[in-house]
């Protein structure tokens, strides 16, 4: 996960656009990253990065508790 | 109406300090990045750093070797931006700005002029 | 850091002619299919002021005869007519990363 948002957020050289990448990244369960993003207001490039970094972070988690379910049948 | 209101001039002798604010009314503080660039006497305009409100985040111009600091208090929607060990090249006029949409200046504070002299 | 190179430093020219700067960028200030240009005008003892962001949109209030065009690296902000009121110092600005970096300036004087 941690390599993949890495890669994901080097592209993005503005710094707030980069944490705006990182902040879509921490785990919220109570909320949908659309949800999340609808409360940024610094501008696009901000939700932009967020949810492309929140999608591909939830992506990621699901994936591999997917994995960890067939393990562990 | 937006409005970026800067201190007044200020005379500094060489190796002191100088404290500059910049007091943003008429749009929500938080929402935007405030930056600070400057401009020598003739010269064209050198971006110095800025500042998110919202979350304190900051990022400045290596040029000034951390002699440039970047605050801001939310309660009273005022940036501020210090700048130690001045010398005398650091004469100029220092402006803020509003960046919108992470993309543009759109309004600027009127200026302050800081000299340096011994 | 991106270095953005105007030219020329200064241009006279006469009213209701074209006047032409140049800005070339070090690096493309494009981000998946956005520009990150901006310009500005600077009149003696007064702050910048807005005119283009995003390569060629004009900023409100912004005479319709200032345009900005280019892509990638090689920007252009026009004036045309020129009028008496645009004397002044011109700058282009990239927005795409940090530092923020200005072009050294285009003096335009009226003849």
């Known amino acids: 996960l941690q390599e993949k948002i890495e890669e994901i957020a080097a592209k993005y050289k503005h710094l707030v656009v980069k944490k705006c990448c990182y902040d879509g990244v921490r785990i919220n369960h109570d909320e949908t990253c659309e949800q999340r993003a609808a409360r940024i207001s610094v501008g696009p490039r901000c939700v932009k990065a967020f949810t492309e970094c929140c999608v591909v972070a939830s992506q990621l988690r699901a994936n591999n508790s997917h994995k960890d379910l067939q393990l562990g049948r | 109406q937006v409005q970026l209101v800067q201190s007044g001039a200020e005379v500094k002798k060489p190796g002191s300090s100088v404290k500059v604010s910049c007091k943003a009314s008429?749009?929500?503080?938080?929402?935007?990045?405030i930056h600070w660039m400057r401009q020598a006497p003739g010269q064209g305009l050198e971006w110095m750093g800025y500042i998110y409100p919202r979350e304190g985040w900051t990022n400045y111009n290596e040029n000034f070797k951390g002699r440039v600091t970047i605050t801001a208090d939310k309660s009273t929607s005022t940036a501020y931006m210090e700048l130690s060990s001045l010398r005398s090249e650091d004469t100029a006029v220092y402006y803020c700005?509003?960046?919108?949409?992470?993309?543009?200046?759109?309004?600027w504070g009127q200026g302050t002029t800081v000299t340096v002299s011994s | 850091d991106i270095v953005l190179t105007q030219s020329p430093a200064s241009l006279a020219v006469s009213p209701g002619q074209r006047a032409t700067i140049t800005c070339k960028a070090s690096?493309?200030?494009?981000?998946?299919?956005?520009?990150?240009m901006n310009w500005y005008q600077q009149k003696p003892g007064q702050p910048p002021k807005l005119l283009i962001y995003a390569t060629s949109n004009l900023d409100s209030g912004v005479p319709a005869r200032f345009s900005g065009s280019g892509s990638g690296t090689d920007f252009t902000l026009t004036i045309n007519p020129v009028e008496a009121e645009d004397t002044a110092n011109y700058y282009c600005?990239?927005?795409?990363?940090?530092?923020?970096?200005f072009g050294g300036g285009t003096k335009v004087e009226i003849k």
């Open positions: 600005q990239q927005s795409l990363e940090d530092p923020h970096t």
């Open positions: 690096q493309s200030v494009d981000f998946e299919g956005d520009n990150y």
């Open positions: 008429g749009y929500t503080f938080t929402d935007h990045i």
């Open positions: 700005a509003r960046e919108r949409n992470l993309e543009y200046f759109d309004y």
